[in-house]
């Protein structure tokens, strides 16, 4: 039975040109994390795995930097990063748990930081 | 106190295989990731591999592929590596070191195991 | 693959004093340096790791810096017990790729 929740930064908003750090965190279970991967819609941003270290994709690495820890920093930042992102942890022997972060990348300087949530 | 302990020195002919073994005491074996590393003539490190003894997963350097092949026995927490067709490119000291979960930096080395290949 | 190149190869100097070591990678491995010490006929022991973390038991004499592309080891003060091979290693990702390696002897 899955009894983990990721904890996620929630709906976050930056400055275009700016970085941000997306970040997630699985609590409430044993369960061993084997892999992390980060995505946004369909595509696959980055892989963090327990032995074989980080892979950035190719197109993002001029704009992606691993870490904090299994986060992922986004610089750089454009409108057109405007969007859902998703932690996908694998993990065993529970299986696979997502968290979704909405960033929002606004032009103007009244960029705020939403609230932490939770995702069952 | 953590210990990885190896085989001792083996003297092989060309084209034959070995098998070295690295024990683990004093930790949790499948808690952490085993790897193997080649050292030449006392030289610098190359890394061969690495083995996850809980899952059974492998990855190998694409240098070693072929050469090198990574096992580990859950029962008497013992990794093992066989290198296959040997020549004297394949004389050198190799290592076992763990490395721990998301910690990709070997934290404890093995005693070391000399190979040396020669008819 | 990342390569490590480290220098200088080799390096004379007394007890007491303070030598630097120094590691480039071909790209950016961030902080995911690690460095290794090994006396003749022993196994590595891990110095470093993360660029600058020290694990315990390794003297405070021992420091390490750098991210991205450029990493160095600094030794205050050196002991007689320092005297061996020193390694860099990137742990960022697969292929794990080390330095040519340093020889710092006794002058």
């Known amino acids: 039975m899955m009894t983990g929740t990721i904890e996620t930064t929630g709906n976050i908003s930056a400055e275009k040109g700016g970085s941000i750090i997306l970040q997630c965190h699985l609590s409430s279970t044993t369960a061993q994390v084997t892999q992390v991967n980060w995505e946004q819609q369909d595509q696959l941003l980055a892989i963090c795995n327990a032995d074989l270290g980080w892979h950035i994709s190719p197109s993002f690495k001029d704009r992606v930097a691993p870490g904090p820890g299994l986060g992922l920093t986004l610089q750089s930042l454009t409108v057109n990063d405007t969007g859902e992102y998703f932690c996908i942890y694998h993990t065993y022997p529970d299986g696979t748990y997502t968290g979704r972060i909405f960033l929002e990348v606004l032009e103007s300087s009244v960029a705020e930081h939403g609230a932490r949530f939770q995702i069952p | 106190e953590f210990q990885l302990q190896q085989s001792g020195p083996e003297l092989v002919k060309p084209g034959a295989s070995v098998k070295i073994s690295c024990r683990a005491s004093?930790?949790?074996?499948?808690?952490?990731?085993m790897n193997w590393v080649q050292q030449t003539n006392g030289k610098s490190l190359e890394w061969i591999g690495v083995?996850?003894?809980?899952?059974?997963?492998?990855n190998y350097n694409q240098k070693f592929k072929g050469k090198a092949t990574l096992t580990v026995d859950q029962s008497s927490s013992a990794a093992y590596i066989q290198l296959n067709s040997l020549t004297s490119e394949d004389s050198a000291v190799y290592f076992c070191a763990r490395n721990g979960n998301f910690a990709w930096y070997f934290d404890v080395w093995g005693t070391g195991t000399t190979v040396t290949v020669s008819s | 693959d990342i390569q490590m190149t480290q220098s200088p190869a080799s390096l004379s100097a007394s007890v007491g004093e303070t030598v630097t070591i120094t590691c480039r990678a071909s790209e950016n491995i961030f902080s995911y340096l690690a460095w290794y010490q090994q006396k003749q006929g022993k196994s590595p022991q891990l110095l470093v790791y993360?660029?600058?973390t020290l694990p315990e038991g390794v003297p405070s004499r021992f420091s390490g810096s750098g991210s991205g592309t450029q990493f160095s080891l600094k030794i205050n003060s050196l002991q007689s017990e320092d005297f061996g091979s020193y390694y860099c290693?990137?742990?960022?990702?697969?292929?794990?790729?080390f330095g040519g390696g340093t020889k710092l002897e006794i002058k």
């Open positions: 993360n660029a600058k």
């Open positions: 290693q990137h742990h960022y990702g697969v292929p794990w790729t």
């Open positions: 004093g930790y949790s074996f499948t808690a952490y990731s």
């Open positions: 083995i996850n003894p809980k899952f059974g997963t492998i």
